[in-house]
Amino acid sequence: GATAGTIDTKRNISAEEGGSVILQCHFSSDTAEVTQVDWKQQDQLLAIYSVDLGWHVASVFSDRVVPGPSLGLTFQSLTMNDTGEYFCTYHTYPGGIYKGRIFLKVQESSDDRNGLAQFQTAPLG
């Protein structure tokens, strides 16, 4: 089990549809070194970072997920379907496995909420 470090993360974050958000898990340890980091949903991988191979972003997210800052991810062009749980997994040596969970709530953009740009009036005549 994990004995030599901690993961800190915001458990709940929100962002606007069409906007972007940073998914970040902060790992701290005096002794363990990170060898690999996974970012995933229940059944979909977002990205993997490994010390030897660097970043690998899953193809389905490659146009919307940018590695960083640090070992986090910047998730862009958010849609309502992106609402849900995201898991970070830090594989470390010799400390073991450390995990974090983030719930992302994607909200309608403020323009939509205010009813702007909903209707276009046709010119008379």
Partner: antibody, heavy 119, light 106 residues
């Protein structure tokens, strides 16, 4: 829709070799760690081997290490299991499955292919 | 390597009853456990990951619990279609399965 289809199962004599395959579709194969898991008659599930998304890192269960080789062909979307020095204890249905991340839970499974080792 | 011991080996339960099965790890595995259901002639299905997270689409009568070395899978009101083998699996490092629990419905 994610699909995993195993093939190549056969009746084989003890000491011989066999290579089974799994064709993946409905997702980007090269993004995911993959695994082989087997179910032997009157026994439970046994993890056999897993391989990283790019193929350079492999992991094996104790009972097959040194005899079996897991590999993948990402351009063809195929996962392989080369089984050497087969014994009767290797008789099982072999399932191909997809990890979500690194060596974690298995959401998607194939229907299995039967390997029988007998003289 | 860590060994996953499941108990009981089999159980026979009436529909509507509550059932709990156990999985014990030989060493601390934190919450790095998944549970699967497998019916004869079918592929296994993921029920629970990280010991207590229900996979999407899994009925809420299935609940996972535990941490460290002792884990449980509870079915709060067993249905006829729940007759199956249930396996725990240690995830990461060496993804070992337990020996399984067979659930029969009376």
């Amino acid at each position: 829709e994610v699909q995993l289809v195993e093939s190549g199962g056969d009746l084989v004599q003890p000491g011989r070799s066999l290579k089974i395959s799994c064709v993946a579709s409905g997702f980007t194969f090269s993004d995911y760690y993959m695994a082989w898991v087997r179910l032997a008659p009157q026994k439970g599930l046994e993890w056999v081997a897993s391989i990283s998304y790019e193929g350079s890192r492999t992991h094996y269960g104790d009972s097959v290490r040194g005899r079996f080789i897991i590999s993948r062909d990402n351009p063809k979307n195929i996962l392989y299991l080369q089984m050497n020095s087969l014994g009767s204890e290797d008789t099982a249905t072999y399932f191909c499955a997809r990890h979500t991340g690194t060596l974690d839970w298995l959401v998607y499974w194939g229907q299995g292919t039967l390997v029988i080792v007998s003289s | 390597n860590i060994v996953m011991a499941q108990s009981p080996k089999s159980m026979s339960i009436s529909a509507g009853d509550r059932v709990t099965m156990n999985c014990k790890a030989s060493q601390n595995v934190d919450n790095n456990i998944a549970w699967y259901q497998q019916k004869p002639g079918q592929s296994p299905k993921l029920l629970i990951f990280y010991a207590s997270n229900r996979y999407s689409g899994v009925p809420d009568r299935f609940t996972g619990g535990g941490y460290g070395t002792d884990f449980t899978l509870t079915i709060k009101s067993v249905q006829a279609e729940d007759a199956a083998f249930y396996y725990c699996q240690r995830i990461y490092n060496f993804p070992t399965f337990g020996s399984g629990t067979k659930l029969e419905i009376k």
